[in-house]
């Protein structure tokens, strides 16, 4: 690699060389001083080149010599203005100035892009005293330049509260292209165009871009950075990268995978978390999302009873949290359950179906046609009813609970009776005469006690008065008269 030092906008060359004001590192510089460390930089510039005071900040001393000759204006000697070199090479550059010996405590500081360079920089100042003046040489070396070393370097010296500033030395570190924007992985719709962007910088400029798709070059000719590739659509996954070229060589971006959005895979591992008489809590593990986020899921429920009509209940829910409570189910019933989820492309297939059962519940309806008689001879109240419909028993009947409330002259007393499931009649003793007896009956399963029937009232007279007429509740929706034999 050629390291070029160029003096810009100056009337005469600094070095003899291949072109004015330039230096190639392949050639030996006119003067190179070894470092104390023994490290030989790629490029060194000597302060002892013929020079002239620069036109920048100049301090004109007011002191005159014994012969009353005015001292010359103080200024840094002119040095190289522009150094171009490759990354990781070494460089050394310097400022020099001759200061009359009357000045004490002169120090030189280095500045880069307007900020003073302090601390761990390789800056060395050497003093060469003579009879009248001291030559001061401030050297700055960088052993392995990086892009961050690019910039404008100057020396500053303070004398008599005057600041003397050198001409800038521009350091340009050249290297392989450096990506400032690389293509990003994406999930795209099949056969739909999309854009990828690639941007790289030097120096040196220009930087040219080549796009690569599945290891084939997309553009036959280089495109100036930044480059936007419009991919006209894909039918299958593809890998893209971009190559950035400059005079120093080639840098290749990371390869990015572009995926094609597809319908999701079906959910897996549908499982029953909890069952009640009328609900089932299920969970599932979502399948692969097809490179597109899940939107929602559908739970499909079929009665597993071979005699059922095969209709499917569908429950829609959000995709998260992969849990759903299926409600409004029948008790003690078997169901087949499947789950399907969708993304922006469409619905997945249904998961493998699983079998689930609801538990026994309390009956959902009360016994029907409750009828109450007063049997005065035995001083009992006879109660009769009809079983609730099988479908609404929600389990296996274990019996009935009878509530009878006796009300007389401001006194009220409720009693409960449990009777077995075999009969559909019961007999209770009269508790109070000259009172109203209110009867309600509920069916009982292992799942619990169902709702009570509507109250049936019968008046229990004082001893000796007989009323044969029964009191009853008609069966819901049944307009036929109840016949009691």
């Amino acid at each position: 690699a050629i390291t070029e030092a160029r003096e810009e906008a100056k009337p005469y060359p600094l070095f003899p060389g291949p072109f004015p004001g330039s230096l190639q590192t392949d050639h030996t510089p006119l003067l190179s001083l070894p470092h104390a460390s023994g490290y030989q930089p790629a490029l060194m510039f000597s302060p002892t080149q013929p020079g002239r005071p620069h036109t920048g900040n100049v301090a004109i001393p007011q002191v005159t010599s014994v012969e009353s000759k005015p001292l010359p204006p103080l200024a840094f000697k002119h040095t190289v203005g522009h150094i171009i070199l490759s990354e990781h090479k070494g460089v050394k550059f310097n400022c020099s100035i001759s200061v009359p010996n009357i000045y004490q405590d002169t120090t030189i500081s280095w500045w880069k892009d307007g900020k003073e360079l302090l601390g761990a920089h390789h800056a060395i100042t050497q003093f060469y005293p003579d009879d009248e003046v001291t030559a001061i040489i401030a050297s700055f070396s960088i052993t392995s330049v990086q892009r961050s070393d690019n910039g404008s370097y100057i020396c500053k010296m303070k004398i008599n509260n005057e600041e003397i500033v050198s001409d800038p030395i521009y350091i340009e570190v050249q290297g392989l292209p450096h990506f400032t924007k690389q293509p990003e992985s994406m999930n795209v719709t099949r056969n739909t165009a999309f854009n990828l962007t690639c941007q790289a910088v030097g120096p040196p400029e220009p930087v040219n871009i080549f796009w690569v798709q599945n290891s084939s070059r997309v553009n036959e000719q280089p495109e100036k950075s930044p480059s936007v590739l419009t991919v006209p659509g894909l039918t299958e996954m593809a890998v893209f990268s971009c190559e950035a070229h400059n005079d120093k060589g080639l840098t290749v971006s990371k390869g990015v995978q572009i995926n094609i959005k597809a319908i999701p895979s079906p959910p897996t591992e549908v499982s029953i978390r909890n069952s009640t008489a009328h609900s089932i809590l299920i969970s599932w593990v979502p399948g692969f999302d097809g490179y597109s986020p899940f939107r929602n899921c559908s739970i499909q429920v079929k009665e597993a009873d071979p005699l059922s009509n095969g209709s499917v209940m569908i429950f829609n829910t959000s995709a998260l949290p992969h849990l759903y409570q299926i409600k409004q189910l029948q008790a003690l019933a078997n169901y087949s359950i499947g789950v399907s989820c969708m993304n922006e492309i469409g619905w997945s297939a249904v998961s493998p179906w699983i079998l689930a059962s609801t538990t026994e519940g309390a009956p959902s309806v009360a016994p029907l046609n409750v009828t109450v008689f007063l049997n005065e001879s035995s001083d009992n109240v006879d109660i009769r009813w009809m079983k609730p419909p099988t479908k609404q028993q929600d389990g296996e009947l274990v019996g009935y609970r009878i509530s009878h409330v006796w009300q007389s002259a401001g006194i009220s007393k409720e009693l409960l009776e449990e009777v077995g499931q075999n009969g559909s009649r019961a007999r209770i003793s009269v508790q109070v005469h000259n009172a109203t007896c209110t009867v309600r009956i509920a069916a009982v399963t292992r799942g619990g006690v169902g709702p009570f029937s509507d109250p049936v009232k019968i008046f229990i007279p004082a001893h000796g008065w007989v009323d044969y007429a029964p009191s009853s509740t008609p069966a819901p929706g049944n307009a036929d008269p109840v016949l009691i034999i």
Partner: antibody
């Protein structure tokens, strides 16, 4: 608008040479490659190769090396196809085309008929 | 070199009919371009990158396919559509053309 204008028909004797020109206009010449396509009488299209207008580097398809030379004059936005030692089987219409991304040939010259006959 | 085989070589149809032209590649390609050529004229671009209509091409033309199998469809033939159609692959050099399908009036 983009145009590729080719030189006129040529009648040559076997062993002679011919140089077909293709002048581009309506776009930046050095941004797109120039491809050459041959079509023999009554036959299909045959890709001959292309020239990189940025670097000047030619690429030749198999069967088109040696006697076929692609060249450029970027100052006048023109690509050239030169065929030397002409044979009767070189008789064909030669098309220049502009190559874009994905090797798509989006603009074609009108074609130049080269007839080789003694 | 990727060989492109077009079929049928000739397709005889009437105006208004649907034309389906096939192009098969000897190995998988990234995209297929299609060109139309009429007698005495230069080819003109028809479909870019498998399924994108070139500018000025009517919507009755469509392209599809992937891998090694690609199709050009003309939904309802117009009199001006009777011509020779060529496919051309993008994937690897050399850039090859198919042998062409001639769509002629029955």
């Amino acid at each position: 608008q983009v145009q590729l204008v080719q030189s006129g028909s040529e009648l040559k004797k076997p062993g002679a040479s011919v140089k077909v020109s293709c002048k581009a206009s309506g776009y930046t010449f050095t941004n797109y490659g120039v491809h050459w396509v041959r079509q023999a009488p009554g036959q299909g299209l045959e890709w001959m190769g292309w020239i990189n207008t940025y670097t000047g580097e030619p690429t030749y398809a198999q069967g088109f090396t040696g006697r076929f030379v692609f060249s450029l004059d970027t100052s006048v936005s023109t690509a050239y196809l030169q065929i030397s030692s002409l044979k009767a089987e070189d008789t064909a219409v030669y098309y220049c085309t502009r190559g874009t991304r994905y090797a798509y040939m989006d603009y074609w010259g009108q074609g130049t008929l080269v007839t080789v006959s003694s | 070199e990727i060989v492109l085989t077009q079929s049928p070589a000739t397709l005889s149809l009437s105006p208004g009919e649907r034309a389906t032209l096939s192009c098969r590649a000897s190995s998988s390609v990234g995209y297929m371009h299609w060109y139309q050529q009429k007698p005495g004229q230069a080819p003109r671009p028809l479909i870019y990158a498998t399924s994108n209509l070139a500018s000025g091409i009517p919507a009755r033309f469509s392209g599809s396919g992937s891998g090694t199998s690609y199709t050009l469809t003309i939904s309802s033939l117009e009199p001006e559509d009777f011509a020779v159609y060529y496919c051309q692959q993008w994937s690897s050099n050399p850039r090859t053309f198919g042998g062409g399908t001639k769509v002629e009036i029955k």
